[in-house]
């Protein structure tokens, strides 16, 4: 019996289409497969950022795969052909691995890249990113921000920079259509007549960096002799009510502080007849049903009631 062998795929490579980290891994069928013309071969693909302990593994019949990578580091990938047992009248046959790597040739020393990059998606409407210039760079250094997400034909440059002392230190983004729940890629590169500037790459999903507006229209309603219902409204904007968590701070008579986290726009507070003053503030955050992370809003304006009779039906400031 001759041992059945299969070659690895041809032309295995990583292609950078200029999407700032979203890369294509592609290959061609192996040579000498004509004995298995009727057989659908599969490919086992493994890939990772260099330095990562774990490989991502994909088994596919396709000749390409796409995924996002951190371009601050190199990428390594390997692939082999799998001949299923149906094709060989026995056990699965694997080829040797074909391997490839990809990295952006770094320019400049690491200290020249932007520092303290911070991006916030205000009220799920306005993206703003800010940074500090690299360490020891001269004033002639300028940074440029490029971004891409699936749906854009090509990477776009920021058109509305925030400046300080003539240097770009941030970017106000335009309206980003259909940009959430997908990876958002950013590259900040730089130029200087004095020395090369290291590029930085960032990837996040916009729904995870949302900072909502604070809640509005805070009110009190007496529910019973010992209960007061605190109510508020969701902030104006595109975020639906089901996406909010709230944190409340309640102060009774300048002493007792109650903190609570709730999922809807009400909170019932137990009170005593001795309560003379009640104040509360609320802030909002996108919850786990709509994002994996988020940023607390600023606190709302304080709503207080002061007086002798906390038994009135509705207490509005």
């Amino acid at each position: 019996d001759t041992e059945i062998k299969v070659n690895p795929p041809q032309d295995f490579e990583i292609v950078d289409p200029g999407y700032l980290g979203y890369l294509y891994l592609q290959w061609q069928p192996p040579l000498s497969l004509d004995h298995f013309k009727e057989c659908t071969v599969e490919y086992e693909l493994k890939y990772r950022n260099i330095g990562s302990e774990t490989w991502k593994t994909i088994i596919t019949k396709n000749l390409h795969y796409k995924d996002g990578f951190d371009l601050n580091k190199g990428i390594e990938a390997k692939i082999h052909t799998l001949l299923p047992w149906q094709c060989t009248n026995g056990s699965e046959v694997q080829s040797s691995w074909a391997e490839t790597t990809y990295w952006i040739s770094p320019q400049g020393i690491p200290e020249t890249k932007v520092q303290d990059m911070d991006c916030v998606y205000y009220n799920w409407q306005y993206l703003l990113c800010s940074w500090k210039p690299g360490i020891g760079v001269l004033l002639d250094t300028n940074y440029n921000l490029f971004y891409w997400y699936e749906g854009l034909d090509h990477a776009l440059q920021c058109v509305d920079y925030i400046k300080a002392d003539g240097q770009n230190i941030g970017c106000r983004f335009p309206y980003l259509e259909a940009s959430d729940y997908k990876d958002f890629y950013i590259c900040v590169n730089g130029s200087s007549e004095n020395k090369p500037i290291r590029s930085s790459y960032f990837t996040f999903q916009l729904q995870n960096i949302v900072k909502p507006l604070p809640p509005v229209y805070l009110t009190f309603t007496r529910e019973s002799s010992c209960e007061i219902k605190l109510k508020w409204s969701i902030p104006l904007g595109p975020i639906p009510a089901r996406c909010f968590d709230y944190e409340i701070e309640i102060r009774e008579d300048d002493t007792t502080l109650v903190t609570a986290t709730v999922e809807n726009e009400t909170y019932t507070l137990k009170t005593t007849n001795e309560t003379r003053q009640l104040c509360f503030v609320v802030r909002s955050k996108v919850n786990i049903y709509c994002s994996d992370d988020g940023i607390w809003s600023e606190w709302s304006d304080k709503q207080c009631w002061e007086g002798e009779d906390l038994s009135k039906k509705t207490l509005l400031r």
Epitope: N7, Q10, D11, E13, I14, V15, D16, P17, Y24, Q26, Q28, P29, P30, L31, S32, L33, D34, F36, K37, L63, H64, T100
Partner: antibody, heavy 122, light 107 residues
Framework: EVQLLESGGGLVQPGGSLRLSCAAS????????MSWVRQAPGKGLEWVSY????????YYADSVKGRFTISRDNSKNTLYLQMNSLRAEDTAVYYC???????????????WGQGTLVTVSS | DIQMTQSPSSLSASVGDRVTITCRAS??????LNWYQQKPGKAPKLLIY???SLQSGVPSRFSGSGSGTDFTLTISSLQPEDFATYYC?????????FGQGTKLEIK
């Protein structure tokens, strides 16, 4: 519709250089390997060079190795052939062609440009 | 390098004839063989790939066969537009090579 349009040919002296370009349209350029094939006047076809879709793999005919360099700019959908140390025997029509593969690894040239004439003469 | 030899070098035939062109490889190339048609002043056109697969848009009167070292291109009923030069090309090696061509002329 797949289109390949070569340019850059012309008359050059022996020992001189020339850079051919091939502008591609109508397909996802980075997904395909590309080849240059030449045809001397009144002669048959001679394969010159191949480059994979991402540019990681390049191959050359022995007759041009060390003198010619194939490259591509996927952002511009353009294939190049840099020809140095040109000789009289490099005189030919140069075609760029798109490479495809059958599902079992058979490579073939399924679309060709109309060619550009390179004449090496003193 | 793998050498490809076509025969005949030239061939005269009439419209409606059945024509066969052969191509021999200097070593086994399995079924990694392609056929191209070229008309004067024009670019080559792919007819058959992988020895027997008909390229999309090519008339079914063209067919290819063979494996290993011996291959044939057959035109079942010659049409006026088929008078051209035909080339075989091996694709097993990373250095592809063409046959010298077969010129098909009107008798």
């Amino acid at each position: 519709e797949v289109q390949l349009l070569e340019s850059g040919g012309g008359l050059v002296q022996p020992g001189g250089s020339l850079r051919l370009s091939c502008a591609a349209s109508g397909f996802t350029f980075y997904s395909y390997g590309m080849s240059w094939v030449r045809q001397a006047p009144g002669k048959g076809l001679e394969w010159v060079s191949y480059i994979s879709g991402g540019g990681s793999y390049t191959y050359y005919a022995d007759s041009v190795k060390g003198r010619f360099t194939i490259s591509r700019d996927n952002s511009k959908n353009t294939l190049y052939l840099q020809m140095n140390s040109l000789r009289a025997e490099d005189t030919a029509v140069y075609y760029c062609a798109r490479g495809s593969y059958s599902h079992y690894g058979a490579h073939y040239l399924d679309y060709w440009g109309q060619g550009t004439l390179v004449t090496v003469s003193s | 390098d793998i050498q490809m030899t076509q025969s005949p070098s030239s061939l005269s035939a009439s419209v409606g004839d059945r024509v066969t062109i052969t191509c021999r490889a200097s070593q086994s190339i399995s079924s990694y063989l392609n056929w191209y048609q070229q008309k004067p002043g024009k670019a080559p056109k792919l007819l058959i790939y992988a020895a027997s697969s008909l390229q999309s848009g090519v008339p079914s009167r063209f067919s290819g066969s063979g494996s290993g070292t011996d291959f044939t291109l057959t035109i079942s009923s010659l049409q006026p537009e088929d008078f051209a030069t035909y080339y075989c090309q091996q694709a097993l090696s990373s250095l592809p090579t063409f046959g010298q061509g077969t010129k098909l002329e009107i008798k």
